[in-house]
């Protein structure tokens, strides 16, 4: 299936050109998205471009600015949030990145109704997290790895905890590895509905082994950045639940919530916090070994002052064949009912899809089946539930949005986006407002993004928010590569594939293949989305086959593609990109002497893998700050998927998988070995740790470190990082400069 | 009805040690936060020491930190001061209240503890 | 730590009459943390009115309380023989919490 074709056609070819890297790295063919900040069940405030903060209301079609950009302009503000009670607007300024979601700012509160700003009380800084509550204008904040609450914005503070030690504990924002690899989130707090309560909760780091790596910065002495990390089999954080009364919290103090006894007889992880309504809430926990997930619904019992989670609203899932859930465990979507949830899990054919539960697991009724997976579920009204899926057309690289109308029986089910733009669109996601009034969809490809605003009851299509038309025009002129989504059946195993060919790709010619991977358990490389990026150039301009391939381990294909790989990270993923370069070798177009693989982290450790797997299918390979071992790497992470590092557990597997057991192999292979120093996640001594079996194995390779750099390699590292290794690659396909 | 009843107290020399309870009855004990208040002879009310509910948290006043020990049992709706180190200024009525900072709405009848040589 | 001053130290009325008792705090408290407390002699404080200025349970409806930011007043709209004691006020916003130093109303 040809899912962009190129616009070439030879009279028109003089005036085309092909993509350079100058492009990529200038993001000259970046997209932009269109998400409104919904604020009711009609209304949405948008950030113009020239940066005023204006209230749309769909239904009256009028338009204004709330907040200029001469006052954003004031305080240098990047972003903002507007209070439930629309009395006040907070303006965040000073961002300041740590990790992947966490950051630190400065906070200034804008009093709408006298255009001043709050004077008197002002917020300490940094802060570590902000945000108002659900109703009127209370503000919860996290200062110093504490929690502050003000009532109102010109009141003192009420701090809430008092423990908070910097790399010790942590209230109301997540540790390292619970924001990495558990909550992806920068907080650790949530509001109930009405905010009456606030919930949050704490870690304790006190007994977490620690990395620490240098960091050069242009000082005498390099500093040392420290950071509690619990690699695999070692200690982890001590996670705490707890709920104050936020109308007066000086009484009562924090409620602890107690873990379901299950749960808290062996090391155990606490996975979100939903609220279902101001006094009932919902808690997932998660045994350490995690093919165990406890779903516990807790209730404020108002005589007691305490909140009471009986065991008959304990909801157990467990996974047999793997780990519970897929990436994370899914979270419950409740209904009206207040008690009953809609929740995302495997059917008893292994397949991931939306089950009903009113009583108890086993009697869950399953709202969606087939040999496709749910992936998300947006939003449950009273009559309707939006979910995305990938059942259409049996593609798994594919996202549309159905509704299922629940207030009929049977149910019935309406696929949304499936022919609004079928070319153009075949991978969304959606925003939806206040009881699902109305909803933007945003559409990521194949074709250029494009978002909508749509009517929630009738789904009609009301305007276009953004369609990228300056994009569309200026890639008129450019020779885009063509791009084919295909599977191949291998054993059993359907390994579909992306393959991102020359503009003027001529099958009975021979190109350069080069393999980009990821590979890990719960990815997907092959999606039905637009990017001009640095492999579009090496198709454009370097001629080069570029191919993504999904193979065993891999997401939203069913459990048994999914847990293949459990317990045995790096065999299952590395065998199936070598079968399917061999079957790309039979399609007669690969230049078998001139093949290459690439990956970043996961992908760094599989391309690693695959360069020594003594194939002999790979000329050279890059690997971009890779794992080597999975001892280096996150607990939490890790051990979802191998178990633990010790002897009666997996310890063999966890030796037998590692990159420097397969030194000997890279002999025959060029080998470009890539790292930032101060990578907090894949840390640098796993590269180094490559480099020294190398060393030892007296194995030539080629490395490049960036100093200061973390996993990402951004700024201007990212521009010299593809250059190297556009030069790597050109030279190993015999590419002239 | 609610009820706090303070044990405990009595002559102790400077340096030496004391353990004041509190019987509660009349709520549910392990919801609520605790607190001992003082009350030096002719003096005002000063706030010592205060535990939440579970008892996995526990605050104290500068002037008893490293002292002092706030504890409960849950399961006997008991709560306990550990008094170590006492000095003459620590002399005072003790109190039990229940409340964590605050809107302390009950209170036991108190307990002297009188810190002399 | 936040210093709560009353005033004044002693307040001499005769029953039936209005008392007005203030708290000044050395910075920013707001009602939603500011407690007052009757004492008698020989007597554990007694809650009058709880944090947000609401009467505590079993309070008559003469004593209230008012008040934000750093300045508050307990009122008695009419003495009865009973409520001559000393009256304590208390901020919870801030650790440690703190008392007065009370002010004691006396028989005129």
């Known amino acids: 299936i040809v899912l962009r074709p190129s616009r070439v056609h030879n009279s028109e070819e003089n005036t085309m050109r092909a993509l350079t890297l100058k492009d990529i790295l200038n993001g000259t063919f970046s997209y932009k998205t269109f998400f409104p900040n919904w604020i009711s069940g009609q209304e949405y405030l948008h950030q113009s471009a020239d940066n005023n903060i204006v209230l749309y209301n769909i239904e009256t079609g009028q338009s204004y600015t709330i907040l200029s950009n001469r006052t954003m302009k004031s305080v240098n503000a990047s972003n903002y949030g507007l209070s439930p009670d629309r009395q006040f607007v907070y303006l965040e300024s000073d961002y300041s990145k740590l990790w992947r979601y966490s950051y630190t700012a400065t906070y200034y509160i804008y009093d709408l109704s006298n255009g001043e700003f709050v004077r008197g009380n002002e917020l300490p800084r940094p802060i570590q997290y902000l945000c108002w509550s659900p109703v009127g204008s209370k503000l919860a904040y996290v200062y110093q790895n504490n929690i502050y609450l003000k009532q109102r914005p010109g009141d003192p503070p009420f701090q809430i905890t008092f423990n908070g030690r910097e790399n010790k504990i942590f209230n109301g924002i997540p540790d390292w590895v619970y924001e990495e690899e558990m909550l992806a989130t920068k907080y650790a707090l949530w509001w109930s509905p009405n905010g009456k309560f606030l919930a949050y909760a704490e870690f304790n780091d006190t007994d977490i082994p620690v990395i620490a790596y240098s960091y050069y910065g242009d000082e005498q002495y390099p500093r040392t950045i420290n950071i509690p990390y619990p690699k695999a089999g070692a200690k982890n954080p001590v996670v705490r639940i707890f709920i104050i009364d936020t109308t007066y919290p000086a009484y009562v103090g924090p409620q602890e919530v107690p873990v379901p006894a299950m749960i808290a007889s062996s090391d155990y992880y606490f996975s979100w916090l939903t609220w279902v309504t101001d006094e009932r809430v919902c808690l997932q926990w998660l045994k350490r070994v995690q093919n165990v997930s406890v779903l516990s619904i807790c209730d404020f019992r108002e005589d007691w002052q305490t909140w009471d989670c009986p065991k008959t609203q304990e909801h157990i899932e467990e996974s047999r064949t793997g780990w519970a859930g897929g990436f994370f465990v899914s979270t419950p979507v409740f209904s009206y009912d207040a008690i009953s949830y809609y929740k995302i899990f495997s059917d008893k054919d292994g397949y991931k899809h939306i089950h009903y539960i009113k009583d108890t697991v086993e009697n869950a009724i399953q709202i969606t089946s087939g040999k496709w997976e749910a992936i998300n579920i947006f939003r449950v009204t009273q009559d309707s539930l939006f979910y995305s899926s990938n059942e259409f057309e049996e593609y798994p690289g594919r996202r549309n949005i159905y509704r299922i109308s629940i207030g009929s029986y049977p149910p019935s089910k309406k696929c949304v986006t499936c022919h609004l733009r079928k070319e153009r669109c075949q991978y969304y996601t959606a925003s939806f407002s206040d009881y699902a009034k109305y909803y933007a969809l945003v559409c990521y490809g194949p074709g250029i993004p494009i978002s909508t605003l749509h009517d929630g009851r009738t789904d009609q299509e009301i305007k276009i928010l953004e369609e990228n038309k300056e994009l569309e025009n200026a890639l008129k002129n450019i020779q885009l590569p063509k791009e084919e989504i295909k599977k191949l059946e291998v054993d059993e195993i359907t390994l579909w594939y992306k393959m991102i060919l020359p503009p003027q790709f001529d099958r009975s010619k021979k190109y350069p293949l080069l393999i980009q991977v990821y590979g890990g358990p719960c990815s997907q490389s092959v999606r039905s989305v637009f990017a001009v990026n640095w492999i579009s150039y090496l198709a454009s301009k370097e001629g080069m086959v570029i191919a993504l391939v999904d193979g065993r381990g891999t997401a939203f294909q069913g459990d048994k593609l999914l847990y293949a790989v459990y317990r045995k990270l790096g065999v299952y993923e590395v065998e199936d990109q070598i079968t399917a370069v061999r079957k790309f070798i039979e399609m007669g177009f690969i230049d078998e002497k001139r093949i290459a693989i690439w990956g970043w982290s996961y992908g760094g450790y599989v391309s690693s893998l695959a360069l020594a797997s003594g194939t002999g299918l790979f000329k050279c390979g890059i690997a971009v700050a890779p794992v080597s071992s999975w001892e280096y790497y996150a607990s939490v992470y890790t051990e979802r998927f191998m178990g633990l590092p010790t002897k009666d557990d997996n310890l063999e597997h966890y030796k037998n998988s590692t990159v420097m057991a397969r030194a000997e192999y890279f002999r025959n292979v060029d080998y470009l070995l890539i790292h930032g120093t101060a990578d907090d996640n894949v840390h640098f001594q796993n590269s180094a740790q490559i480099a020294k079996a190398l060393v030892n194995a007296q194995v030539d390779f080629q490395a490049m470190w960036y100093s200061d750099q973390n996993h990402g390699l951004s700024g201007l590292s990212t521009n010299h990082l593809y250059t190297h290794m556009t030069h790597f690659l050109k030279q190993c396909f015999s590419l002239s400069d | 009805e609610v009820q706090l009843l303070e044990s405990g107290g009595g002559l102790v020399q400077p340096g030496g040690s004391l353990r004041l309870s509190c019987a509660a009855s009349?709520?549910?004990?392990?919801?609520?936060?605790m607190s001992w208040v003082r009350q030096a002879p002719g003096k005002k009310l000063e706030w010592v020491s205060a535990?939440?509910?579970?008892?996995?948290?526990?605050y104290y006043a500068d002037s008893v930190k490293g002292r002092f020990t706030i504890s409960r049992d849950n399961s006997k709706n008991t709560l306990y001061l550990q008094m170590n180190s006492l000095r003459a200024e620590d002399t005072a009525v003790y109190y039990c209240?229940?409340?964590?900072?605050?809107?302390?709405?009950?209170w036991g009848q108190g307990t002297l503890v009188t810190v002399s040589s | 730590e936040i210093v709560l001053t009353q005033s004044p130290g002693t307040l001499s009325l005769s029953p039936g009459e209005r008392a007005t008792l203030s708290c000044r705090a050395s910075?920013?408290?707001?009602?939603?943390?500011l407690a007052w407390y009757q004492q008698k002699p020989g007597q554990a404080p007694r809650l009058l009115i709880n944090v947000g200025s609401r009467r505590a349970t079993g309070i008559p409806d003469r004593f209230s309380g008012s008040g934000s930011g750093t300045d508050f007043t307990l009122t008695i709209s009419r003495l009865e023989p009973e409520d001559f004691a000393v009256y304590y006020c208390?901020?919870?916003?801030?650790?440690?919490?703190?008392f007065g130093q009370g002010t004691k109303v006396e028989i005129k």
């Open positions: 910075q920013s408290v707001t009602s939603s943390y």
């Open positions: 535990i939440i509910g579970s008892g996995s948290r526990t």
């Open positions: 208390q901020q919870g916003i801030m650790l440690p919490p703190t």
């Open positions: 209240a229940k409340g964590w900072f605050g809107g302390f709405n009950y």
């Open positions: 009349g709520f549910t004990f392990s919801s609520y936060a």
